[in-house]
């Protein structure tokens, strides 16, 4: 008795849904009462299917209402784990364990990304020095580098700080500040670049015509 996992790595976006598969041999009609299916993530019980039905009692609270084992797929010899509204904490190694006559298991890795799509920006000016302070801030995962460029695509040196956001999701809050002497209508870009995936998102900042007063430092995003 051998089970197969068509894919052993799934990479999905935070907030999306994922469907992970383990296939097992079924001859003729599946006897649901003889089938045992476990999906586990490390020491957390995700799905337990025993004696023809899902047992939700041992299911870990973090998966409650989000993890499903479609019965119609089971009948085809496919133990599918569906997780909705994927969280960062769902990332890790899952194990599907199936007993049907014999027993076997396969491991599957889930990676979760949160792109730095929504980039907040702010431009302020220090009246004493006429130096502009450009700020870009975004949340995502995993860590991103922030690259500043001017309209000639030349790299500029900004100062980036990374904190863990106080949301339940523990996304990374990446803020980068560039101090630069600039004139009205000068264009700058901040790019949030996730090193490992190569994915990037860019915002354009244009120095306004009118001087912008420096905002207080105790601002929140």
């Amino acid at each position: 008795f051998t089970i197969t996992a068509p894919k052993d790595l799934y990479v999905v976006e935070y907030g999306s849904n994922v469907t992970m598969e383990c296939r097992f041999p079924v001859e003729q009609k599946l006897d649901l009462l003889a089938l045992v299916v476990y999906w586990e993530k490390e020491d957390k019980e995700v799905i337990q299917f025993v004696e023809g039905e899902e047992d939700l009692k041992p299911q870990h609270s973090s998966f409650r209402g989000r993890a499903f084992l479609p019965k119609d797929q089971l009948l085809k010899g496919n133990a599918v784990l569906q997780i909705t509204d994927v969280k960062l904490q769902d990332a890790g190694v899952y194990c599907c364990m199936i007993s049907y006559g014999g027993a076997d298991y396969k491991r599957i890795t889930l990676k979760v990304n949160a792109p730095y799509r929504k980039i907040n920006q702010r431009i302020s000016m220090d009246p004493a020095t006429s130096e502009h302070e450009l700020m870009c801030q975004a949340e995502g995962y995993p860590e991103a580098e922030v690259i500043w460029t001017n309209s000639d695509h030349q790299s500029l040196s900004g100062e980036t700080t990374v904190t863990t956001s106080q949301t339940e999701e523990k996304l990374l809050n990446v803020t980068s500040v560039l101090r630069v002497n600039a004139t009205a209508n000068d264009v700058f870009h901040c790019t949030f670049w996730r090193v490992h995936s190569g994915e990037n998102h860019t915002a354009e900042l244009i120095i306004p015509e009118l001087p912008v007063p420096r905002l207080p430092h105790n601002r929140t995003h």
Epitope: V36, D43, E45, V93
Partner: antibody
Framework: EVQLLESGGGLVQPGGSLRLSCAAS????????MSWVRQAPGKGLEWVSS????????VYADSVKGRFTISRDNSKNTLYLQMNSLRAEDTAVYYC?????????WGQGTLVTVSS | DIQMTQSPSSLSASVGDRVTITCRAS??????LNWYQQKPGKAPKLLIY???SLQSGVPSRFSGSGSGTDFTLTISSLQPEDFATYYC?????????FGGGTKVEIK
């Protein structure tokens, strides 16, 4: 601190029986699959048997299938291995191991010697 | 069954040496390979799981790499307490199988 303590090993004649026990502490025993792994004198490691967390499913190496029975009592935090029809080639140190992403914790082992 | 082949079966090295042990699976096991250290008369101890993840409490001089069928355990700077036998193990289906072991001895 995770602790696994095997007992029940000893000298037994070919064809005889032994029951090994493994007392677990320091973790939620019922949340993990458990296994037995053995090591013949001067040899490498050989997986023997595994039991899933609630005891419903048991799996065995071909070399012991039909002769050994793994079981667990989650209320007593104890893993068992009933060994029947023992053979000389079953002589080994038997380890119980907690199974998660790997055999992450092992007991100190108990020696089973099958000899006439 | 998936066969695990370790090489070399033994090696001699000095304190401070960089040591590399390889493990080959007879078919792809993705990255689900573990490494253990065993000293004489003692139980095995988990060093690396999932090919490259360092088990808690294990010194950072130990590292693992590889995926598919070929894997490596590296000890960056051998210490006196590292002289032992090392085993790889595939952990992606029954029966769970171990390599034959690599004994690291003092030169």
């Amino acid at each position: 601190e995770v602790q696994l303590l095997e007992s029940g090993g000893g000298l037994v004649q070919p064809g005889g029986s032994l029951r090994l026990s493994c007392a677990a502490s320091g973790f939620t025993f019922s949340s993990y699959a458990m296994s037995w792994v053995r090591q013949a004198p001067g040899k490498g490691l050989e997986w023997v048997s595994s039991i899933w967390r609630n005891g419903i499913v048991t799996v065995y190496a071909d070399s012991v299938k039909g002769r050994f029975t793994i079981s667990r009592d989650n209320s007593k935090n104890t893993l068992y291995l009933q060994m029947n029809s023992l053979r000389a080639e079953d002589t080994a140190v038997y380890y119980c191991a907690k199974w998660s992403a790997a055999f992450d914790y092992w007991g100190q082992g108990t020696l089973v010697t099958v000899s006439s | 069954d998936i066969q695990m082949t370790q090489s070399p079966s033994s090696l001699s090295a000095s304190v401070g040496d960089r040591v590399t042990i390889t493990c080959r699976a007879s078919q792809s096991i993705s990255s689900y390979l573990n490494w253990y250290q065993q000293k004489p008369g003692k139980a095995p101890k988990l060093l690396i799981y999932a090919a490259s993840s360092l088990q808690s409490g294990v010194p950072s001089r130990f590292s693992g790499s590889g995926s598919g069928t070929d894997f490596t355990l590296t000890i960056s700077s051998l210490q006196p307490e590292d002289f032992a036998t090392y085993y790889c193990q595939q952990d992606n289906g029954y029966p769970s199988t171990f390599g034959g072991g690599t004994k690291v001895e003092i030169k």
